[in-house]
């Protein structure tokens, strides 16, 4: 959570001379209340931007707009103070707005924006703006919250993004996992365009349980040029433990812009379908479709071999 | 001295309800996503619930959601948990946290004790 | 969600000892560790957070590492007051999963 590094940071518009000034999110107000502080704002809208810096780095900033309510309190409003909060660190971000000139009605509903907030993929904000001067104790609130998630690396405009990109969100392995006889597992992926190792990691469950049956880590070599972009195929031996039979496969590259903490990919197997409370089947039924024209039932061995091939 | 003093448990049969109470003092509350946290007998620590300093983001444990209520005075400095349609596994010290700037919690209350019992 | 899994679950070792413990996510965490530890009767204490820096006030003979699925604390020399429960806890996204724990007691 920090600035978005090289904007000189403007909030002035026609009608207002405004300043931005860092905030060490306690604005004085709060220290010595005043009488008389305007009500909050109206409408706070969030939504995700890419902006690049000085370094030419694409990076997710929050874009929060928001705008005055049509009262008289606008006479006496001085400013805003925004807060981003991340909630899981408590890590906590504020920007001062500063009226530098006092606030008149017009005929359009003033409205302000804010876009210099860098958040991180897969991060929960609590934003808040806060009209200044801060009510007295026990005044009404004149603030407004709304919370916001930002996307993983997954979502596509996040995808590009220099903190995703360095945690290899570019790389589509295009997992196939096919279930052989005899207990194994076909992995397929493709592989990326740098010579770096990969691990895969199985982990296989009872069916609609969560607790693992069979866990296998298959190291596979950094590849080289030649084989890049191409893909990668291994057999994987399961434990022959009836019903552990959901597998879950993960792959992690260890790419060097992320080394151990590179975005993994997975697919998963699914148990085969059981019927609930499979109906036993008559001796005399044919499990076969007979050939046009012919009646014939085959013996029983016959019907045997074709009843445990209909089940496989 | 920044403290953490939990209030409201005690014994309750299953179904029953209690409502426990943290009370913050020697920080600012108001700028504190604040936990609950829960400890069964003899057993590990188990996140409750987690409410951010102005409520507007809540989330909750999978086992309490739908049961339990998280909310914030933070005119008073307090913390509440609303315990509904309580049950034999809900029984646990239950702490309130307060978490670090840069991850984890540094601030827990002593814990107050809910007893769930027929 | 993302599991959290401990090893060992308990263990045994003399003053003076090097001890390693081992905490997993089932998924990458990036760096939101953090590691407690319970004496018994008594409430947890933060040890370390962002899986590496030490909260203040913590004995310099514990350490943390790791980042993104597999993470290890380590106590270079235990001490008789180091006999407790160690904790380990994601943060990163809700829910913020605790491991199950790992018991250290003297030998």
């Known amino acids: 959570l920090r600035l978005l590094d090289h904007r000189a940071l403007v909030c002035s518009q026609p009608g207002l001379n405004c300043t931005v000034k860092n905030s060490t999110c306690l604005d004085d107000s709060w220290i010595h209340p005043r009488n008389l502080t305007p009500s909050s704002p109206k409408n706070i809208y969030i939504n995700l931007s890419v902006s690049s810096t000085q370094h030419g780095e694409l990076v997710p900033v929050l874009h929060v707009e928001w705008t005055l309510q049509t009262d008289a309190s606008i006479l006496y409003l001085e400013g805003a103070e925004l807060s981003v909060l991340q909630l899981n660190t408590n890590e906590r971000l504020c920007v001062r707005f500063e009226f530098l000139s006092k606030l008149r009605h017009h005929h359009r509903r003033w409205r302000f924006t804010f876009s210099h907030f860098v958040v991180d993929p897969d991060q929960e904000y609590e934003v808040t703006v806060h009209h200044l001067p801060k009510p007295i104790p026990d005044g009404d609130p004149n603030h407004q919250s709304k919370n916001f998630l930002v996307p993983d690396c997954e979502h596509a405009r996040m995808k590009v993004t220099t903190p995703c990109m360095s945690s290899g969100s570019l790389w589509d392995p295009n997992i196939t996992v096919e279930t052989l006889e005899a207990h194994q597992l076909r992995v397929s992926f493709t592989l990326w365009n740098e010579s770096t190792h990969y691990q895969i990691l199985l982990t296989s469950f009872p069916h609609m349980e969560n607790h693992s049956c069979f866990e296998h880590m298959h190291h596979i070599p950094a590849p080289r040029p030649e084989e890049f972009h191409q893909r990668s195929n291994v057999t994987l031996t399961l434990r022959n433990l009836k019903g552990c039979c959901r597998h879950q496969v993960q792959i992690q590259p260890f790419f060097s812009s992320c080394l151990n903490d590179c975005l993994r990919h997975s697919a998963t197997v699914s148990c085969p379908e059981m019927p609930d409370t499979p109906e036993p089947i008559p001796d005399y039924m044919p499990l076969w479709e007979p050939r046009s024209g012919s009646s014939d039932y085959k013996d029983d061995d016959d019907k045997g071999s074709s009843h445990h091939h209909h089940h496989h | 001295e920044v403290q953490l003093v939990e209030s409201g448990g005690g014994s309750v049969q299953p179904g029953g309800s209690l409502r426990l109470s943290c009370a913050a003092s020697g920080f600012t509350f108001s700028s504190y996503s604040m936990n609950w946290v829960r400890q069964a007998p003899g057993k590990g620590l188990e996140w409750v619930s987690i409410?951010?300093?102005?409520?507007?983001?809540?989330h909750y444990a999978d086992s309490v959601k739908g049961r339990f209520t998280i909310s914030r005075d933070n005119a008073k400095n307090s913390l509440y948990l609303q315990m509904n349609s309580l049950r034999d596994e809900d029984t646990a010290v239950y702490y309130c946290?307060?978490?670090?700037?840069?991850?984890?919690?540094?601030?827990w209350g002593q814990g107050t004790t809910v007893t769930v019992s027929s | 969600d993302i599991q959290m899994t401990q090893s060992p679950s308990s263990l045994s070792a003399s003053v003076g000892d090097r001890v390693t413990i081992t905490c997993r996510a089932s998924?990458?965490?990036?760096?939101?560790l953090a590691w407690y530890q319970q004496k018994p009767g008594k409430f947890p204490e933060l040890l370390i957070y962002a899986a590496s820096t030490l909260q203040s006030g913590v004995p310099s003979r514990f350490s943390g590492s790791g980042s993104g699925t597999d993470f290890t604390l380590t106590i270079s020399s235990l001490q008789p007051e180091d006999v407790a429960t160690y904790y380990c806890q994601k943060y990163n996204r809700a829910p913020f999963t605790f491991g199950p724990g790992t018991k250290v007691d003297i030998k």
């Open positions: 946290a307060r978490p670090k700037v840069g991850g984890g919690m540094d601030v």
């Open positions: 409410i951010s300093s102005r409520s507007s983001i809540i």
């Open positions: 998924q990458g965490i990036s760096n939101y």
